[in-house]
């Protein structure tokens, strides 16, 4: 069964800066990745970035830099101030559309006890949905 993992980290240097890393653990070919916050994409969440393996990357504030880390994992740096700033309990979700498995989505947030600059290891996140 495919899995999606999500890792959220607050940067030590800037407390309003977050890094989200997501990966797809499956054998299929990824056709699109959507990163959202505030909940799953299409279920109250707001899209931060869309990454297509061949068409490129689109992102919207407070996303600052989205990129492919490998063929099956991505990272996104968020920088916020004021209303658009993420907070420690913000939920971030990553949805991977792949062939032939379909769409798989997982969500995660900053570990409650994490110090700036630290993060939980990238394990499959608890919220997992297949379309």
């Amino acid at each position: 069964t495919p899995e999606v993992w999500v890792q959220v980290r607050m940067e030590a240097t800037e407390l309003s800066s977050f890094t989200i890393r997501c990966g797809f653990l499956g054998s299929g070919s990824i056709s699109l990745v959507t990163v959202s916050w505030g909940g799953p994409n299409g279920a109250g969440g707001t899209t931060l970035a869309v990454l297509h393996p061949e068409r490129g990357i689109r992102q919207w504030a407070p996303a600052r830099q989205a990129r492919w880390e490998t063929q099956s994992s991505i990272s996104l740096i968020l920088e916020g101030s004021g209303a658009s700033s993420p907070c420690a309990n913000t939920t971030f979700c990553c949805k991977f559309a792949s062939f032939p498995e379909g769409s798989w989505e997982a969500c995660g947030s900053l570990p409650p006890s994490s110090d700036p600059g630290l993060s939980a290891p990238p394990t499959p996140a608890p919220i997992l949905r297949a379309d």
């Epitope: 707001t46 899209t47 393996p53 061949e54 490129g56 492919w68 880390e69 063929q71």
Partner: antibody, heavy 114, light 113 residues
């Protein structure tokens, strides 16, 4: 099928503003971002910016930051681009294009003339 | 900004012959993480909006005839029409799909010789 509808032409006076529309149909409007592109004869295509209707948040080409304002009305599935302080160099054909530029509107010709 | 430069500016080719358009970017369009080139090609016929032909430097959009092909990597790319047809007369643009702002080449006008 996915369609983007734009009015054919706008004739405006120098120094005024114009608000161009792009009505989307055939898909969920909030799940597909809208780009705006300028075409002037002999000058090629220029990307003005994009906006994601789900978050109302735009990105701008720095060159157009003080010229264009991108907005959306999700209730009518329409994207708008307002152009201000119009001058002769703003006379052009303006296209809206969906997502990764795979669907285009027919374009609106803006003519700035007194 | 990434500057896209096409050559030639205009091109006249006989029907059935090969047409080649080059595009050079001022920065690499290769994504190091997934080794994909983010470059697209568009065709614009008179009185029509641009039409996506090729993305990812070499992937044909659905419905595009196989006489159109794209190649290249990094900063140098090529659009090839293997056997020119009358309906291919148009202006062709390359586009940086890699990073904001999404810049286009100046266009290459393709005509029948």
């Amino acid at each position: 099928q996915v369609q983007l509808q734009q009015p054919g032409a706008e004739l405006v006076k120098p120094g005024t503003s114009v608000k161009l529309s792009c009505k989307a149909s055939g898909y969920t409007f909030t799940s597909y971002w809208i780009n705006w592109v300028k075409l002037r004869p002999g000058q090629g295509l220029e990307w003005i910016g994009d906006i994601y209707p789900g978050s109302y948040i735009p990105n701008y080409n720095e060159k157009f930051k003080n010229k264009a304002t991108l907005t959306v009305d999700t209730s009518s599935s329409t994207a708008y681009m307002q152009l201000t302080s119009l001058a002769s160099e703003d006379s052009a054909l303006y296209y809206c294009a969906g997502g990764y530029f795979d669907v285009w509107g027919a374009g609106t010709t803006v003519t700035v003339s007194s | 900004d990434i500057v896209m430069t096409q050559s030639p500016d205009s091109l006249a080719v006989s029907l059935g012959e090969r047409a080649t358009i080059n595009c050079k970017s001022s920065q690499s369009l290769l994504s190091s993480g997934n080794q994909k080139n983010y470059l697209a090609w568009y065709q614009q016929k008179p009185g029509q909006p641009p039409k996506l032909l090729i993305y990812g430097a070499s992937t044909r959009e659905s419905g595009v005839p196989d006489r159109f092909s794209g190649s290249g990597s990094g900063t140098d790319f090529t659009l090839t029409i293997s056997s020119l047809q009358a309906e291919d007369v148009a202006v062709y643009y390359c586009q940086n799909d890699h990073s904001y702002p999404y810049t286009f080449g100046q266009g290459t006008k393709l005509e029948i010789k």
